[in-house]
């Protein structure tokens, strides 16, 4: 099964090669809309130093395999090389959200990207009714990524002084109320991203339409609108809308819940102070430590490494997990030196899979939570690659 591009087609996505000060605009179904890249450019690369843009992938020259999308051009790699053409290659992996295209590397001829997204999953279990891009790059080309805040079921209760109503929101996607562990959101209309509970009734007061917008280096905004359908009586003829402003705090702090700052005629303004609104390099590293200079906090997990010893064992319902954090490769899991996490099926100990690799390690500290992530594991039946937190 090929990648389901429909969910990705509605938006122009951005990726960045910060080393070379280049920004890529990506529209997997057609024209990105930058005139200097031409009318059929699917991937347009802009060099911020020279302010020149050129197409590195043509929508008319697209080819696809199950998890690979390639866009060719008619341009030679170099003036002297008419044989090889510039092209873009996007590798798709199954993910829990629409995700973001990540620049991997570029040669003279090929620009490589990787995209972990629900659009690449074999099964629909993570697919949203409606989801919008949930990240933005700032002036310094640093990424602000709210994808980790997206709830796959249920929503966030907005802090509000009104005892008669409760406003629930999700981030960048609709509230999957049917899979909500608490039953109170089951009454919310399908597709809503902002659900107002009033008495025993639920009202749709906004749906995602456009992606996250960056206002400044520490403020992002997301708007949900309810355009069609009946307007609730208490809206006084106005169409409901919810504006959520995400604010990166000025210093490290515990997470807070979203707060209602204003409401009038079903126009709700919400402010959410969260470290996820800060740029990603402030929150995470690919090593096992965070430093006070870069991350405003000092954390070092390397003492947890099992130097030559046996791995940590974690007992799950169906699987036993063997974990070797912060990688001493002398401990071989799954008979593989690259494996950081290995899972063994309890019912059948011959079924052993890599659930995460050392080279795909991310340590993240945000809103008071410390998370160590190992991705790049073997493929699951859903098309997902194992991913361990």
């Amino acid at each position: 099964q090929a990648v389901d591009l429909d969910a990705l087609c509605s938006y122009t996505w951005e990726a960045v090669d910060s080393k070379n000060n280049a920004v890529y605009k990506i529209n997997v179904c057609g024209n990105v809309g930058i005139s200097s890249c031409g009318p059929t450019s699917a991937i347009c690369m802009c060099d911020l130093k020279t302010e020149n843009c050129r197409s590195v992938g043509d929508s008319l020259l697209r080819s696809s395999a199950r998890s690979l999308l390639e866009f060719n051009t008619t341009m030679g790699c170099q003036p002297s090389d008419s044989q090889h053409r510039i092209q873009t290659s996007i590798t798709f992996l199954c993910g829990k959200t629409l995700g973001t295209p990540e620049f991997v590397t570029a040669t003279d001829c090929v620009h490589y990207f990787e995209w972990r997204t629900t659009a690449a999953c074999k099964k629909d279990i993570f697919k949203a009714d409606k989801e919008v891009p949930c990240y933005a790059f700032d002036d310094k080309l640093q990424k602000h990524d709210l994808n980790p805040l997206i709830k796959l079921n249920g929503g966030y209760l907005v802090d509000d002084s009104d005892p008669d109503t409760s406003l629930f929101i999700n981030v960048c996607r609709d509230i999957d109320s049917l899979r909500d562990p608490s039953t109170q959101l089951r009454v919310c209309p399908a597709g809503t991203a902002a659900c107002l509970l009033k008495g025993n009734q639920a009202f749709d007061v906004g749906r995602p339409k456009e992606g996250l917008k960056l206002l400044s280096k520490d403020r992002l905004v997301l708007t949900y609108v309810k355009e069609e359908g009946e307007k609730p009586d208490f809206c006084n003829g106005h169409s409901p809308a919810v504006t959520v402003t995400f604010v990166c705090p000025s210093e490290r702090r515990e997470g807070t819940i979203p707060k209602l700052t204003a409401k009038s005629n079903c126009r709700y303004e919400v402010e959410w102070i969260t470290e996820y609104a800060c740029h990603r390099d402030y929150l995470q590293s690919e090593s096992c430590s965070l430093s006070s200079e870069q991350h405003d906090i000092t954390i070092d997990l390397s003492p947890l490494a099992q130097y030559g010893g046996s791995p940590y064992v974690s007992d799950g319902r169906e699987y036993t997990f063997f974990i070797n954090v912060c990688g001493d490769t002398k401990v071989s899991l799954c008979n593989n030196k690259e494996a950081a996490v290995c899972q063994e099926k309890k019912a059948d100990s011959t079924q052993v899979k890599i659930a995460g690799r050392h080279q795909n390690q991310t340590l993240r500290y945000s809103d008071g939570d410390l998370t160590l992530i190992y991705s790049g594991g073997d493929e699951c039946s859903s098309g997902h690659h194992h991913h361990h937190h």
């Epitope: 122009t12 809309g33 339409k209 917008k213 960056l214």
Partner: nanobody, 119 residues
């Protein structure tokens, strides 16, 4: 060739009004978010107001809320900034910009129009 052309700036007394227009040529206007920036002497260029491609997201800087209104007319490929109750601190060069993805790094800029609020 893409062009954004601002007009409507000028000298106005405190409390007065101006309407800035920005006409876009050579771009698929309906696909772009439109942003008004302003830059006072010696200050950074900053966003005053923005309107997304579908007009779903409209945003104002705190100091202009309730006084300025941004709107767009996709048929005329034009974005407007209605400025009421103008104050001396609104004095600046106002720039119109068009962005596909990033409001902070627009894809196209206008040349700017001077707004001076003084008695």
């Amino acid at each position: 060739q893409v062009q954004l052309q601002e007009s409507g700036g000028g000298l106005v007394q405190p409390g007065g009004s101006l309407r800035l227009s920005c006409a876009a040529f050579g771009l698929n206007f309906k696909n772009f978010d439109m942003i008004w920036f302003r830059q006072a002497p010696g200050e950074e260029r900053d966003i005053v107001a923005a309107i997304s491609s579908s007009s779903s997201t409209i945003w104002y800087e705190d100091s202009v809320k309730g006084r300025f209104t941004i709107s767009r007319d996709n048929a005329k490929n034009t974005v407007y900034l209605q400025m009421n109750s103008l104050k001396p601190e609104d004095t600046a060069v106002y720039y119109c910009a068009a962005a596909l993805t990033s409001w902070r790094r627009p894809d196209y800029w206008g040349q700017g129009t001077q707004v001076t609020v003084s008695s």
